[in-house]
C-alpha cells in the first residue's frame, strides 16, 4: 500500500503570530517504520535549508538560526520515552512562533520510512499583516484646482491593502505606498481629490479597504469639509407686492462654511426705503411704497469671502388676486 504526505498547499500566518504547518503521513500502515522526519526550506541559502528534524530516539532538533529553536516546535510528534514505547511521528506538524517576513517561503516536510523510502510534501507559508485603517477629511478652501479633500490610510499591511472610494461626486484618487515601520509591511495612502466647491461640503464619501486578512472590506465614512464663500439666494418675494402691503419680508438664504459673519442689505439704485428694516438675514417691510420698485441686494460675508444675491421687486397698484398666495425667490 502506497503512503503519501498530507500537507496544505498554502498556509497563511499573521506577522508576529503563530502558525502551524500541518504534515501527516497517511494512511497508517502496519509495519511501516518512520525512521526520521525533517522539515526543509529548499529555497533558502544552503546553511539555512535544514529547519527541523525529529529523530525517534533523540527527539526534535532545530539546527538553523532562522527560524531557530526558540521559535519552532513539533506540535504532536513524540519521541520514544523508553525502550518499551514507540515514537509517534505520523503527525509531523510544525509550529512556527513570532512570525517574521523572512519566514515566508516553501517548506518541505519529509518522512524517511522503511520499507517505502522517503516521501515528502511541500507547503507555501505566506506571512500576512492585518493593516490598521483610518480615514479623515482634510479642511480645505474652495479653489479652481484639484485638491485633496480626504485621506484614507491603511497602515502596515502585508500584502499592501487595496483602497477605493465610494462617492457620487466628480473625483479622482491618488495613491502612494511606503514601507511600514514593521519590516515587510506597506502603508498605503489614498487621497480623495476634487475641485473643492460648496457642493462637496458636508457630503459623506466612503473609503473602502480590502485585504485578505479581512472577512469583508472595511468601510470608513468621511464627511467632507470645504470652506467656501457664502452662496446666497433671496426668498420671500411672491410677485404680489402692492402699495400699502404690510406683511412683506425678504430672507437672505445662505449656504456657507464657515458661518456668515455679516449681512448687508442694499439696493442697486442706491436709495433704501425707510420702511424697510434690515434684521440680520431678514429685511422686514413695514409698508410697501413706490420706492420698493427697485432691486434689493443681500451681501453676505464669511471668513473665506463674500457672496451676494439680487431680487427685482415690482410694486403693483392693487393686489394680484390671480396669483395670490404664491411665493417666490
Amino acid at each position: 500500500q502506497d503512503v503519501r504526505v498530507q500537507v496544505l498547499p498554502e498556509v497563511r500566518g499573521q506577522l508576529g503570530g503563530t502558525v502551524e504547518l500541518p504534515c501527516h503521513l497517511l494512511p497508517p500502515v502496519p509495519g511501516l517504520y518512520i525512521s526520521l522526519v525533517t522539515w526543509q526550506r529548499p529555497d533558502a541559502p544552503a546553511n539555512h535549508q535544514n529547519v527541523a528534524a525529529f529523530h525517534p530516539k533523540m527527539g526534535p532538533s532545530f539546527p538553523s538560526p532562522k527560524p531557530g529553536s526558540e521559535r519552532l516546535s513539533f506540535v504532536s510528534a513524540k519521541q520514544s520515552t523508553g525502550q518499551d514505547t514507540e515514537a509517534e511521528l505520523q503527525d509531523a506538524t510544525l509550529a512556527l512562533h513570532g512570525l517574521t517576513v523572512e519566514d515566508e517561503g516553501n517548506y518541505t516536510c519529509e518522512f524517511a520510512t522503511f520499507p517505502k523510502g522517503s516521501v515528502r510534501g511541500m507547503t507555501w507559508l505566506r506571512v500576512i499583516a492585518k493593516p490598521k485603517n483610518q480615514a479623515e477629511a482634510q479642511k480645505v478652501t474652495f479653489s479652481q484646482d484639484p485638491t485633496t479633500v480626504a485621506l484614507c490610510i491603511s497602515k502596515e499591511g502585508r500584502p499592501p491593502a487595496r483602497i477605493s472610494w465610494l462617492s457620487s461626486l466628480d473625483w479622482e484618487a491618488k495613491e502612494t505606498q511606503v514601507s511600514g515601520t514593521l519590516a515587510g509591511t506597506v502603508t498605503v495612502t489614498s487621497r480623495f481629490t476634487l475641485v473643492p466647491s460648496g457642493r462637496a461640503d458636508g457630503v459623506t464619501v466612503t473609503c473602502k479597504v480590502e485585504h485578505e486578512s479581512f472577512e469583508e472590506p472595511a468601510l470608513i465614512p468621511v464627511t467632507l469639509s470645504v470652506r467656501y464663500p457664502p452662496e446666497v439666494s433671496i426668498s420671500g418675494y411672491d410677485d404680489n407686492w402692492y402699495l400699502g402691503r404690510t406683511d412683506a419680508t425678504l430672507s437672505c438664504d445662505v449656504r456657507s462654511n464657515p458661518e456668515p459673519t455679516g449681512y448687508d442689505w442694499s439696493t442697486t439704485s442706491g436709495t433704501f426705503p425707510t420702511s424697510a428694516v434690515a434684521q440680520g438675514s431678514q429685511l422686514v417691510i413695514h409698508a410697501v411704497d413706490s420706492l420698493f420698485n427697485t432691486t434689493f441686494v443681500c451681501t453676505v460675508t464669511n471668513a473665506v469671502g463674500m457672496g451676494r444675491a439680487e431680487q427685482v421687486i415690482f410694486v403693483r397698484e392693487t393686489p394680484n388676486t390671480a396669483g395670490a398666495g404664491a411665493t417666490g425667490g
Epitope: G31, S35, T38, D84, E86, K116
Partner: antibody, heavy 116, light 107 residues
Framework: EVQLVQSGTELKKPGSSVKVSCKAS????????IHWVRQPPGKGLEWIGA????????NYNQKFKARATITAVTSTSTAYMELSSLTSEDSAVYYC?????????WGQGTTVTVSS | DIVMTQSPSFLSASVGDRVSVTCKAS??????VVWYQQRAGQPPKTLIY???YRYSGVPDRFTGSGSGTDFTLTISSLQSEDLAEYFC?????????FGQGTKLEIK
C-alpha cells in the same frame, strides 16, 4: 537497555547454508524491524534485508532475495537470517541491527567463513 | 540501486588537522544520508543523520553538510580517538546502500 545478541562464529563449506540468530531484549520486539547487514573482511557494509516481527513481513535487497530468508520468532524475541548456496564471497561479519532513526543498535557480529 | 561513491578510500592526517570525507550519490537522495564511524572490531556508530544533524554525544568537531547528491563529513580538529573507518549510507530509497568506506589513519 536494548541488546542484540548474535550466535557464534560459523565455518561453512561452499554450496551449504548458514543460519545466524539475533536475540533481542530491552524493547518491544514486535514493534521494530530487525535488519541484517554484512561486512566482508576489509570491505564496506552491505544491507541484506529486514524482518518486521509484528506481522513477519520481510523486505530484501534484490541481490540476496533468491538466497536469503529472514524470519522472526516472537515467543523468543529472536530474528534469523539464513543464507544458502554459500560461496567464498559470502565470507563476512554479519550484523543484526535495529533501525531507530538510523541503525542505532547493533549485535556484536557473527563471523561466517566459507572455505572448502 | 543508488550507488554511494565515497572518497578518499584512505586518509592519513595529523592530530589537529581538518579532514573531509565526501560521498556522492548516483541520484538525488535529498538529505537522507547518515555517517557512521566504525572502530576496529566494533559495529558502526551513528555520527550524523539527515546529512547535517549531529547525533547525541557526538563531539562538535564532527559536522555534516550537503544535499541532493553531494555530501561531506568534516572533522575540524582531528583527535587520536578518531582513528576509525567512516561510512556514508543513504536511506532515501530501498534498498539502503553504503559507501565503500574511508579508513582514517593518524600520522
Amino acid at each position: 537497555e536494548v541488546q542484540l545478541v548474535q550466535s557464534g562464529t560459523e565455518l561453512k563449506k561452499p554450496g551449504s547454508s548458514v543460519k545466524v540468530s539475533c536475540k533481542a531484549s530491552g524493547y518491544i520486539f514486535t514493534s521494530y524491524w530487525i535488519h541484517w547487514v554484512r561486512q566482508p573482511p576489509g570491505k564496506g557494509l552491505e544491507w541484506i534485508g529486514a524482518v518486521y516481527p509484528g506481522n513477519s513481513d520481510s523486505n530484501y535487497n534484490q541481490k540476496f532475495k533468491a538466497r536469503a530468508t529472514i524470519t522472526a520468532v516472537t515467543s523468543t524475541s529472536t530474528a534469523y537470517m539464513e543464507l544458502s548456496s554459500l560461496t567464498s564471497e559470502d565470507s563476512a561479519v554479519y550484523y543484526c541491527t535495529k533501525l531507530v532513526g538510523t541503525f542505532d543498535y547493533w549485535g556484536q557480529g557473527t563471523t561466517v567463513t566459507v572455505s572448502s | 540501486d543508488i550507488v554511494m561513491t565515497q572518497s578518499p578510500s584512505f586518509l592519513s592526517a595529523s592530530v589537529g588537522d581538518r579532514v573531509s570525507v565526501t560521498c556522492k550519490a548516483s541520484q538525488n537522495v535529498g538529505i537522507n544520508v547518515v555517517w557512521y564511524q566504525q572502530r576496529a572490531g566494533q559495529p558502526p556508530k551513528t555520527l550524523i543523520y539527515s546529512a547535517s544533524y549531529r547525533y547525541s554525544g557526538v563531539p562538535d568537531r564532527f559536522t555534516g553538510s550537503g544535499s541532493g547528491t553531494d555530501f561531506t563529513l568534516t572533522i575540524s580538529s582531528l583527535q587520536s580517538e578518531d582513528l576509525a573507518e567512516y561510512f556514508c549510507q543513504q536511506y532515501n530509497t530501498n534498498p539502503f546502500t553504503f559507501g565503500q568506506g574511508t579508513k582514517l589513519e593518524i600520522k
